[in-house]
């Protein structure tokens, strides 16, 4: 059962923690047994991987989302689940793997050339009235998130950040602009090398929150310039 899995003391031997005060990696004694993760219609086995309990999508990795592991299961227990690949069923964007988004309950590619016509059509449909948003676009958050938002809330159409509620900014999403959450500490951010590069993004991120700046993740200094990962960090 899920509870017995969560209570397992076994943990995979992973690289050292990412810094800060996380200076105490647990002594790995054995690998956890293969665990079943929902992956579309069939369950996929991910060997030697211990479930990671979560409360929000932001706690999970980039290739995961936070949800109850069983359909209609214990609503109080959520873990990070492997993201859904293209053509798999979804309820929100966070469920789909990077490079995909949730459209009509299915993960589809966000490749701008292939899907441009379809996406523009979607935006016209979705923003045709004040009560709908882009195919249930929402922050990477739990399944209880509302699919519809009032003006100024997450997912609402905007022209500038002042149109959005506190804690949100106005950022491009496909070929429209909607209110998105200002980034938290530790979240991946976009560092623009030259002026005007904002215009190239179809999934524009908000800026980092107060007291934070977008800087290279310490562990990624050795990476090549093109692949350096930037995150919101304290000044």
């Amino acid at each position: 059962t899920l509870n017995s899995v969560l209570n397992s003391n076994a943990i995979k031997n992973l690289p050292p923690p990412l810094g800060g005060a996380a200076g105490h990696p647990g002594s790995a004694v054995s690998a956890a047994p293969g665990i079943l993760y929902p992956g579309g219609n069939k369950y996929q086995t991910i060997d030697n991987y211990q479930p990671y309990p979560c409360a929000e999508d932001e706690e999970c990795g980039t290739d995961e989302y936070c949800a109850s592991p069983t359909r209609g299961g214990d609503a109080g227990v959520q873990i990070c689940l492997a993201c859904r690949k293209r053509r798999k069923r979804c309820m929100r964007h966070a469920m789909c793997c990077p490079g995909n988004y949730c459209k009509n309950g299915i993960c589809v590619s966000s490749d701008q050339n292939h899907f441009r016509g379809e996406i523009e059509e979607t935006i016209t449909e979705s923003f045709g009235n004040d009560h709908s948003t882009l195919d249930g676009y929402s922050r990477r958050t739990t399944l209880s998130s509302k699919m519809y938002h009032t003006k100024g809330q997450e997912g609402s159409v905007c022209l500038r950040s002042s149109d959005c509620a506190s804690g949100l900014c106005c950022a491009r999403h496909f070929w429209s602009k909607i209110c998105k959450p200002v980034l938290k500490e530790g979240q991946v951010c976009t560092k623009h090398r030259r002026k005007g590069s904002h215009g190239l993004e179809i999934f524009q991120r908000c800026y980092c929150g107060e007291g934070l700046s977008c800087r290279i993740q310490k562990d990624h200094h050795q990476a090549s310039n093109s692949s350096r990962l930037h995150t919101c960090q304290r000044h």
């Epitope: 943990i11 995979k12 992973l14 690289p15 050292p16 923690p17 990412l18 810094g19 800060g20 005060a21 996380a22 990696p25 647990g26 991987y49 211990q50 990671y52 979560c54 409360a55 929000e56 932001e58 706690e59 999970c60 990795g61 980039t62 290739d63 995961e64 109080g76 990070c80 990477r140 938290k184 500490e185 530790g186 979240q187 991946v188 929150g209 007291g211 993740q217 562990d219 990962l229 995150t231 304290r234």
Partner: nanobody, 124 residues
Framework: EVQLVESGGGLVQPGGSLRLSCVAS????????LKWVRQAPGKGLEWVSH????????MYAASVKGRFTISRDNAKNTLYLQMNSLKPEDTAVYYC?????????????????RGQGTQVTVSS
């Protein structure tokens, strides 16, 4: 720099109670879900409990459900764990932890930010 400092551990008899505290700094406390994990001697990390950023939802491992209560005070940047009806098998070092955020492809307890931990020993 993310810092988490736990306190409140100690030696207690079976059936006794303890209240652990964790003071956090270096990040916006009220914006992050937090958790307690523990590590028994010679064992790996075990998730104990979880609380959402605003404290409206909690989760517990089956082994502690009904005995432990997690809570937080966002005004004081403090996380708590009230432990009642303690058992010898609860003996462990208890860590307050926060996710590292979306900087890894797969999250793991090993990659969390944690404090130094506080020792809880349940013995008669």
């Amino acid at each position: 720099e993310v810092q988490l400092v736990e306190s409140g551990g100690g030696l207690v008899q079976p059936g006794g109670s303890l209240r652990l505290s964790c003071v956090a700094s270096g990040f916006t406390f009220s914006m992050w879900p937090l958790k307690w994990v523990r590590q028994a001697p010679g064992k790996g990390l075990e998730w104990v409990s979880h609380i959402t950023s605003n404290g409206d939802r909690t989760m517990y491992a089956a082994s502690v459900k009904g005995r432990f209560t997690i809570s937080r005070d966002n005004a004081k940047n403090t996380l708590y764990l009230q432990m009642n009806s303690l058992k010898p098998e609860d003996t462990a070092v208890y860590y307050c932890a926060r996710s590292a955020g979306q900087v890894v492809s797969r999250a793991s307890l090993e990659n969390d930010y944690r404090g130094q931990g506080t020792q809880v020993t349940v013995s008669s």
